[in-house]
Structures are given as structure tokens and as C-alpha cells.
């Protein structure tokens, strides 16, 4: 597989119509949450939360500030942190709690706190809950979270020093967390989390699962330097912890290595940057797209690999485990475990088979199963990408975030369109055409070439947008700039599945944005402009 060529078209910031939102003296617009039914985009920034019109983000609807008291700032500074940059409240969690409220957490000058934001009054309820384990202390530390049925699942660091990683569920009746142990989480950098719902008519009566994606330091590969490994981990929503062993800890936490490499060249992409779960009516199981860079990235390489969720499920449900063994007194080696596996299977969700055997909850699981999963959280089998190779490899660029849209071209062909942002404020649009990936467009979203920190895709029919957050603000861009292609040739050569040439109006129009019939429109994804 060759490196993806340079983008066919580059739009400079001033050349295209981009809608922007930023407020004076407000920075770090890194938390974005879209409410499609309300046509509202919620933005979490440093010491502030905004609600803006999702169709035109320059229209601010509401704002609320959550500042740190001078006393808190002083205490934070006493501990050696910067009063100007670190001892502030960076909003890190912005999750829907109900139709009328959001759950918001911030670093709060190294004393993480959470609150409920009433969407009607757009005021905080003043709950001031302890945010430890839900939100990082340090704005520089990694974090991820997802709200599942009113309970927050988070991956972050639990302590001030940032040395104690945790994947937890914040729940009034059944809070759970990972063991604080190196084999469970080894200096992870959390990237993404999401829930995958089991279909209601699932024959095995299986549980919903929450997946976590992170990069961590390998325990299984021994080199002179620290080897980073991308991981996919999962827990079961119904997990209630163990009765004695793993009390208030996950009994279903398992993790596996994500493979993204180019075998022919020995290129290994082992630092996970972002993940997007693609759900589509045409997909039986979700596909997740993961964005990677190599560990030693002096040439600016980035790659995208796509994975079937069923491949990951297979590893967790039927794969072999890894075991830590001691050699020469106390030296550790990780090897494939070939011994007997207890029943019920360690780390498995409670399904109808388990229930039939009278294991109705993780609290009923036998000690053997619990002890095994406590000692064997790592799978020996790896999760391999679709087609066993990356979808995209790009040189001289550091990609930061990814979103993917599945769209249908005029001829009925379905394309997965990848929107990938860079550390220089650009957005690349890439698709697979004739077994090769083409970057059909590059748009400079941010004038100051700053890294894109967050990328969000609207899924509502009609007005479709990509939203990008950076340190200085948020930018809203349409999925395509069809109108910029002034001739039929340009429109066809763009090879953009969202665009087609309309001979009656002599314009390049956006498909799926109008209800008008597509008869007579010209689109040739092969780029053959002779049809014009």
C-alpha cells in the first residue's frame, strides 16, 4: 500500500465559507457535544460552557462560567503548579444527563469537580461533586468519558500526580473501578470510550458493553526503551463487581492489542490518537476507525485502520489470555496462557448461558473466575484491521482526530468518507477509490495553524457539518464545498461523493441536501470528466 498522495484540492481559510465561534479571553475549546434534536452545539472551554446554534455556531444562545476561586488558585500554586495556565478550570467532561441537563466536570485547579448544568436556565445546580476518577487533575493529562444510561464511564488519572490511572463507573448503586495495578493499566493515555448496545433480540441475552481505547506502555514486550501499545479494552454494563475478590472492581475488564501496521515495510503504528465508531443502517456491526502515529515519529507519519467490532468481540469471547510468569527470582515475562480456563469464562458478560448456570450477576461468580481475570486482564490475541492493512497512510502530516461518514454516491456505491484533522489546523477528506485512498480535499480550518483538538460530525439529514475545536475557538464546515467547483469538469474531477453537476443550473450541487430528484445530475467517481 502506497502513501496517500497530497490532497487534490486545498482550500485556504479565506477561500471558503467557514463559520467560527470564539469568545474573548476564553481558550481551550476542547469539549463538544451536539444535540441534534435541539440543533444546539454545547462547547466546553476553559472556565466556560456555551450553547450555540448548531446550524450557525456564530450565534451564541447561552453561556455559563465556572471559574476557580483565588483561594483555590493559591492552594494549587503552592503545590508547584502554574497559576496562569494550570490552576484554572478546564472543562473536560460534557455529557448528556437528561433531556434538560448536562453533566459537566472540570479540572478545577487540580481539584476536579463535577456539576449538573440545567439547560433551561443554563445555570449550574451547585452540586460541586468530587470529580476524582471522572476528570483529570491536570489539564495536560489524558481523559475520556461516555454517559451510559445516566452513569458516567471514565478513563483518566485518579490522583494529583497523575500516576494512578483509572477506568471507572460513577454510579450511586454500583460504582466500579479498575485495580490499581500495572498489569491492568500501565501509564495509559486515554483516547476514546463508547457504548455498544446489544440488540434487544440477541439470542444469547448478552449485555451492553463499554469500550475504551488507549495507548499504554507494554508489559509484554521487553526492550531497552518503553514500547507503547495501542489497546482496546471493554467492560460489561451489567458488571457489579465481585463479592469478595474484585469487590467494587470490574470483573469484566479485558484488554487487547490493536494492530495497525504495514507488514511489507515493517511500519508499525503504535500510538493511538483518536477513534470513531461508525454506525450505519447498512452495517450489521459497527466499524471503528482508529487514527495512529508511530512511536518514533520523526517523519510525520499517520495512519488510519478500520476494525470490525466483531473481531474485537471474538478476541474477548474466545481468545487466549496472557500470563505473567516469574523467572530468575523476580524477573517478569508475559506469555500465552495455555492452562485450563475457569467457567464461567473470566471477563465474560453475564449472558443467558451464565444465567442458566445460576450466575445471575457478577456478584455470584466463583472466586476462581474472579481471581483469574484479576491476574489475566490482557488477551494474547490481537485485534486485526479489516483487510489486515491500514485504510490510509499519510506522510509529512500529524493527524489528530477522525470522524467518518458513510454516504451513497449517485450510482448507489457506498463510500466511507474519512474526515481527518491535523496538528496544523487543517481538515483532510479521504475516500477509497479503486483500491487506493485519495485525499480529495484539504481545508485550512484555523488561520493560525493550531492543532485541532476535537472533531464532531452531525448526522442529521439535510444540513450536515463537521465541527472542529481548538485552543482558540470552534469552526463549523460543511461536508463539502460543492459550489466552489465552477465547471462540470472540476465538479467531476473532485471525485466527491457529496457533489454532482447539475446541467440545468450549471452548478456543482450538494447531494442529500435537497429533496430535489437526482435525475440528470452528473457524478463520475472514477473522475472521468468526459461525461461532461
Amino acid at each position: 500500500m502506497a502513501f496517500a498522495p497530497i490532497p487534490r484540492i486545498t482550500w485556504e481559510h479565506r477561500e471558503v465559507h467557514l463559520v467560527q465561534f470564539h469568545e474573548p479571553d476564553i481558550y481551550n475549546y476542547s469539549a463538544l457535544l451536539l444535540s441534534e434534536d435541539k440543533d444546539t452545539l454545547y462547547i466546553g472551554a476553559r472556565e466556560a460552557v456555551f450553547a450555540v446554534n448548531a446550524l450557525n455556531i456564530s450565534e451564541k444562545q447561552h453561556e455559563v462560567y465556572w471559574k476557580v476561586s483565588e483561594d483555590k488558585k493559591a492552594k494549587c500554586a503552592e503545590k508547584g503548579k502554574s497559576k496562569q495556565t494550570e490552576c484554572l478550570n478546564y472543562i473536560r467532561v460534557l455529557q448528556p444527563l437528561s433531556a434538560t441537563s448536562l453533566y459537566v466536570c472540570g479540572t478545577n485547579a487540580f481539584q476536579p469537580a463535577c456539576d449538573h448544568l440545567n439547560l433551561t436556565s443554563f445555570k449550574f445546580l451547585g452540586k460541586n461533586e468530587d470529580g476524582k476518577g471522572r476528570c483529570p487533575f491536570d489539564p495536560a493529562h489524558s481523559y475520556t468519558s461516555v454517559m451510559v444510561d445516566g452513569e458516567l464511564y471514565s478513563g483518566t488519572s485518579y490522583n494529583f500526580l497523575g500516576s494512578e490511572p483509572i477506568i471507572s463507573r460513577n454510579s450511586s448503586h454500583s460504582p466500579l473501578r479498575t485495580e490499581y495495578a500495572i498489569p491492568w493499566l500501565n501509564e495509559p493515555s486515554f483516547v476514546f470510550a463508547d457504548v455498544i448496545r446489544k440488540s434487544p433480540d440477541s439470542p444469547d441475552g448478552e449485555d451492553d458493553r463499554v469500550y475504551f481505547f488507549f495507548t499504554e506502555v507494554s508489559v509484554e514486550y521487553e526492550f531497552v526503551f518503553r514500547v507503547l501499545i495501542p489497546r482496546i479494552a471493554r467492560v460489561c454494563k451489567g458488571d457489579q463487581g465481585g463479592l469478595r475478590t474484585l469487590q467494587k472492581k470490574w470483573t469484566s475488564f479485558l484488554k487487547a492489542r490493536l494492530i495497525c501496521s504495514r507488514p511489507d515495510s515493517g511500519l508499525v503504528f503504535n500510538v493511538l490518537r483518536d477513534v470513531f465508531v461508525l454506525r450505519s443502517p447498512g452495517l450489521k456491526v459497527p466499524v471503528f476507525y482508529a487514527l495512529f502515529t508511530p512511536q518514533l515519529n520523526n517523519v510525520g507519519l499517520s495512519a488510519v485502520c478500520a476494525y470490525n467490532l466483531s473481531t474485537a468481540e471474538e478476541v474477548f469471547s474466545h481468545g487466549k489470555y496472557m500470563q505473567s510468569t516469574t523467572v530468575e527470582q523476580s524477573h517478569t515475562k508475559w506469555v500465552r496462557y495455555n492452562g485450563p480456563v475457569p467457567k464461567p469464562r473470566p471477563g465474560a458478560c453475564i449472558d443467558s448461558e451464565a444465567r442458566a448456570a445460576n450466575y445471575t450477576s457478577s456478584l455470584n461468580l466463583p472466586d476462581k473466575t474472579l481471581q483469574f481475570v484479576k491476574d489475566h486482564p490482557l488477551m494474547d490475541d490481537s485485534v486485526t484491521p479489516i483487510d489486515n492493512r491500514p485504510r490510509l497512510i499519510k506522510k509529512d502530516v500529524n493527524y489528530t482526530q477522525i470522524v467518518v461518514d458513510r454516504t451513497q454516491a449517485l450510482d448507489g456505491t457506498v463510500y466511507d468518507v474519512m474526515f481527518v484533522s491535523t496538528d496544523r489546523g487543517a481538515l483532510h477528506k479521504a475516500i477509497s477509490l479503486e483500491h487506493a485512498v485519495h485525499i480529495i480535499e484539504e481545508t485550512q480550518l484555523f488561520q493560525d495553524f493550531e492543532p485541532v483538538q476535537t472533531l464532531l460530525l452531525s448526522s442529521k439529514k439535510g444540513n450536515r457539518f463537521v465541527y472542529a475545536g481548538s485552543n482558540s475557538g470552534v469552526v463549523q464546515a460543511p461536508l463539502a464545498f460543492c459550489g466552489k467547483h465552477g465547471t462540470c469538469e472540476d465538479c467531476v474531477l473532485a471525485r466527491d461523493p457529496y457533489c454532482a453537476w447539475s446541467p440545468p443550473t450549471a452548478t456543482c450541487v450538494a447531494l442529500h441536501q435537497t429533496e430535489s430528484p437526482s435525475r440528470g445530475l452528473i457524478q463520475e467517481m472514477s473522475g472521468d470528466a468526459s461525461v461532461c
Partner: antibody, heavy 118, light 111 residues
Framework: QVQLVQSGAEVKKPGSSVKVSCKAS????????MHWVRQAPGQGLEWMGQ????????SYNQKFKGKATITVDKSTSTAYMELSSLRSEDTAVYYC???????????WGQGTTVTVSS | DIVMTQSPDSLAVSLGERATINCKAS??????????MNWYQQKPGQPPKLLIY???NLESGVPDRFSGSGSGTDFTLTISSLQAEDVAVYYC?????????FGQGTKLEIK
């Protein structure tokens, strides 16, 4: 059995440095964090810092930043703590301790006495 | 930092009698229903030895005359029937928040 064996007592001059070792045996060294705790004569216990043996990532009590440097040698399953710019108030017994899953120090070294005297 | 204050500083109890040591934290050491409070015993010239972890769990090999209780900010170590070998200094320690901190110690003697 699980054991932590520390290096012997040291007498040092003010301004000098000392490196205390802690050799682990009887368990997977890489699976557990190693911590250091000090006890000044007739005083209580003070947590100094910790290290992750697989990564060498250390974190410190703010009070001991710049004073203590914690390292590991995985090949010999040994943790080290170096104390620099020694002063008389650094005279103490220094312990290494394994930090167990339940967030407690379940195994301790026998202690190394460091005496700083001119 | 969380300050741990033990009381009393020293305690003299007759053999066979109950000994109680208290420990108060300057803020809660609980997280999601777990109390991250540990108790250690230290005899002269020896390193500390773990007795109780997570407020009330007895470390294996420790006699069951030792027990721990409490949550939030107030914790207690109880020796139900004092034995001669229990003469030592006892420390409480919180591991909920770094820097991990110890109490000043309680010296237990025989009356």
C-alpha cells in the same frame, strides 16, 4: 517468599549524595509499584515517592522533589533512591515498600540508615 | 495534603484488656464507598508491618484480635485482648490522595 532487601547503612558528609538500593525477590517485580518512605530519628513515617518498574516513571511528594531521585534496574529487579545535597536533616532510616493492589504497603524492606555528619 | 491525627499519642493497657487507637483525617479518605485507610505496627529496629487495609480488612497472617473500623474521616484500630507482643508504635495511613500521609504514631505499652 516475597522479600525486599536494602543496602547497608551509610555515613555521608553534608553536600554529598547517597544511593540506596532495594532488591526484590519472590514476586514479579514489574507488576507492582515500588515506594520509598523515610523515618527521621524518633519521628513518624513520611512518604517520599514511587516508581513504576516497567516504565521507570517516578512521581514524588512535592517536599522531596529535587532531593530524591527514584530509579529501577529491571534486569536485576532492583529499585534505587538517590539523595542529593545531603544535610543533617536528611539523617533517617529509608524504607522501600511494595504497593499492593488494595492500595497499601504490604511488604517493606528492612530499612537503610543514612547518617549525614561532618 | 491530608493531615492524619492519631489519639492518644501513647497508651498503656493491661494484658488481656482492649486497646483502642483513633485516627482522624483532615478530609474524607473515601472514594465510591471504599475507605483508603491502612494501619501499621512498628516495633523498635524493625520496618512497619501491615495490619489492616481499606479500613477494616485484616492482612493475612495477622491475629484476629486486631480489627479496624470507620469511614470518611474517623477511623479506629482495636486490639480486643492485648498480648505482650503487641507492644509497638501504631500508625494509620491514608492512600486516597497523594501525597500519601501517615499519622504521627501511637505508642502502645503494657500497664
Amino acid at each position: 517468599q516475597v522479600q525486599l532487601v536494602q543496602s547497608g547503612a551509610e555515613v555521608k558528609k553534608p553536600g554529598s549524595s547517597v544511593k540506596v538500593s532495594c532488591k526484590a525477590s519472590g514476586y514479579s517485580f514489574s507488576d507492582y509499584y515500588m515506594h520509598w518512605v523515610r523515618q527521621a530519628p524518633g519521628q513518624g513515617l513520611e512518604w517520599m515517592g514511587q516508581i513504576n518498574p516497567t516504565t521507570g516513571g517516578a512521581s514524588y511528594n512535592q517536599k522531596f522533589k529535587g532531593k530524591a531521585t527514584i530509579t529501577v534496574d529491571k534486569s536485576t529487579s532492583t529499585a534505587y533512591m538517590e539523595l542529593s545535597s545531603l544535610r543533617s536533616e536528611d539523617t533517617a532510616v529509608y524504607y522501600c515498600a511494595r504497593y499492593y493492589y488494595g492500595r497499601h504497603f504490604d511488604v517493606w524492606g528492612q530499612g537503610t540508615t543514612v547518617t549525614v555528619s561532618s | 495534603d491530608i493531615v492524619m491525627t492519631q489519639s492518644p499519642d501513647s497508651l498503656a493497657v493491661s494484658l488481656g484488656e482492649r486497646a483502642t487507637i483513633n485516627c482522624k483525617a483532615s478530609q474524607s479518605v473515601d472514594y465510591d464507598g471504599d475507605s483508603y485507610m491502612n494501619w501499621y505496627q512498628q516495633k523498635p529496629g524493625q520496618p512497619p508491618k501491615l495490619l489492616i487495609y481499606a479500613a477494616s480488612n485484616l492482612e493475612s497472617g495477622v491475629p484476629d484480635r486486631f480489627s479496624g473500623s470507620g469511614s470518611g474521616t474517623d477511623f479506629t484500630l482495636t486490639i480486643s485482648s492485648l498480648q505482650a507482643e503487641d507492644v509497638a508504635v501504631y500508625y494509620c495511613q491514608q492512600s486516597n490522595e497523594d501525597p500519601y500521609t501517615f499519622g504521627q504514631g501511637t505508642k502502645l505499652e503494657i500497664k
